[in-house]
Amino acid sequence: QSGPLPKPSLQAQPSSLVPLGQSVILRCQGPPDVDLYRLEKLKPEKYEDQDFLFIPTMERSNAGRYRCSYQNGSHWSLPSDQLELIATGVYAKPSLSAHPSSAVPQGRDVTLKCQSPYSFDEFVLYKEGDTGSYKRPEKWYRANFPIITVTAAHSGTYRCYSFSSSSPYLWSAPSDPLVLVVTGLSATPSQVPTEESFPVTESSRRPSILPTNKISTTEKPMNITASPEGLSPPFGFAHQHYAK
């Protein structure tokens, strides 16, 4: 045996954003003929010798970071990328609004504002059909997501979540959808890839912050966070059952 065994992949099905009360399964996938899988939950560290974890009813205590490894003979693999399992619907939904308007002429600027009834300091903005989310911490009680020089690619349906940085895996219900319409177009735009859209790959299974030039704020550049793996496209539709 030269070098460690390659890491397995860990995925949440159907999604790593799980409404309270819903079911989810975590699956660790290694090469064929693995002797033993170990699935770990972090904080506090605990483990099961299984290649899957079925959670029939999502609870707050299930949220957190998971990773897995496998053993062949006496050798252990590298650990998988960590999977962040997020419980949603823990708090009331925030409100999402567009300023100055949700109908924006092409080339103009618009700010999407996510406001929570709680003093949360973290907000996540999702666009339906995209594999990425815009995420940034904000002081005070609101999060502004400025979109500078709007293009056709920005039109679509957006939702936001809010949460506290002290409990980063317990999120609110999603906001009601906000439809951003980019006006002054000759035809309905197709969903074209932009710098805000990143395919979810093995390496982005653990949300990672990627810089972008497209989105900016008055304070500092906006970051784009690759979304948790396993959301069934189109992205936002997996969560519509929240809006009751």
Partner: antibody, heavy 123, light 112 residues
Framework: QVQLVESGGGLVKPGGSLRLSCAAS????????VSWIRQAPGKGLEWVSA????????QYAESVKGRFTISRDNAKNSLYLQMNSLRAEDTAVYYC????????????????WGQGTLVTVSS | QSVLTQPPSVSGAPGQRVTISCTGS?????????VHWYQQLPGTAPKLLIY???NRPSGVPDRFSGSKSGTSASLAITGLQAEDEADYYC???????????FGGGTKLTVLG
């Protein structure tokens, strides 16, 4: 109450073999990971081997790999350590210890220990 | 050579506060694994003292406390008593080979 009682220690010559036993009581033995941990005279603790509840998951410290075999008999609530090719540096008190468990999860620490059995490897 | 590093000995007078450090690496404590502490009184088996970095099992006095930061952890004992004289071991888990690792142990002497 939880009890772990080791036995089988004694004096053995280098290259010889010995089989240690640990009798468990006061808990559902087959649900728990258990380990062997040793302590050389005047020295610190060294984890030796661990085994999962069903007996299929086993792990060994590098220092004993290929020489020691851990096993269990859940029907007898017993844990075993077969020690072959013994060396002077294997001289120690051998403890069996239970890993803490809560619901379906195992934890990486030991909540109950036996009183230990002394193994002396000397010619 | 133990995987986790502890001072061989510490001492203090009755009523004083002492701390015992435990230093690991990026593959054990630094990989996110918790640190646990055991007390071994002379001639007896080790006993769980602190689990999950800072939690006390029932029956352990609140004079004992633990903390963890980065790749190291520490055990603090306040209001030192004669019966605290013992060996103290830290323990964690190593991600590389999935093995359980201990510190070399620290002998606590209560002076006077």
């Amino acid at each position: 109450q939880v009890q772990l009682v080791e036995s089988g220690g004694g004096l053995v010559k280098p290259g010889g073999s010995l089989r240690l036993s640990c009798a468990a009581s006061g808990f559902s033995f087959g649900d728990y990971y258990v380990s062997w941990i040793r302590q050389a005279p005047g020295k610190g603790l060294e984890w030796v081997s661990a085994i999962g509840g069903s007996g299929s998951a086993v792990q060994y410290a590098e220092s004993v790999k290929g020489r020691f075999t851990i096993s269990r008999d859940n029907a007898k609530n017993s844990l075993y350590l077969q020690m072959n090719s013994l060396r002077a540096e294997d001289t120690a008190v051998y403890y069996c210890a239970r890993h803490y468990r809560e619901f379906r999860w195992h934890y990486y620490y030991f909540d109950y220990w036996g009183q230990g059995t002394l193994v002396t490897v000397s010619s | 050579q133990s995987v986790l590093t502890q001072p061989p000995s510490v001492s203090g007078a009755p009523g004083q506060r002492v701390t015992i450090s435990c230093t690991g690496s990026s593959s054990n404590i630094g990989a996110g694994y918790d640190v646990h502490w055991y007390q071994q009184l002379p001639g007896t088996a080790p006993k769980l003292l602190i689990y999950g970095n800072s939690n006390r099992p029932s029956g352990v006095p609140d004079r004992f406390s633990g903390s963890k930061s980065g790749t190291s952890a520490s055990l603090a004992i306040t209001g030192l008593q004669a019966e605290d004289e013992a060996d103290y071991y830290c323990q964690s888990h190593d991600l590389g080979a999935h093995v359980w690792v201990f510190g070399g142990g620290t002998k606590l002497t209560v002076l006077g």
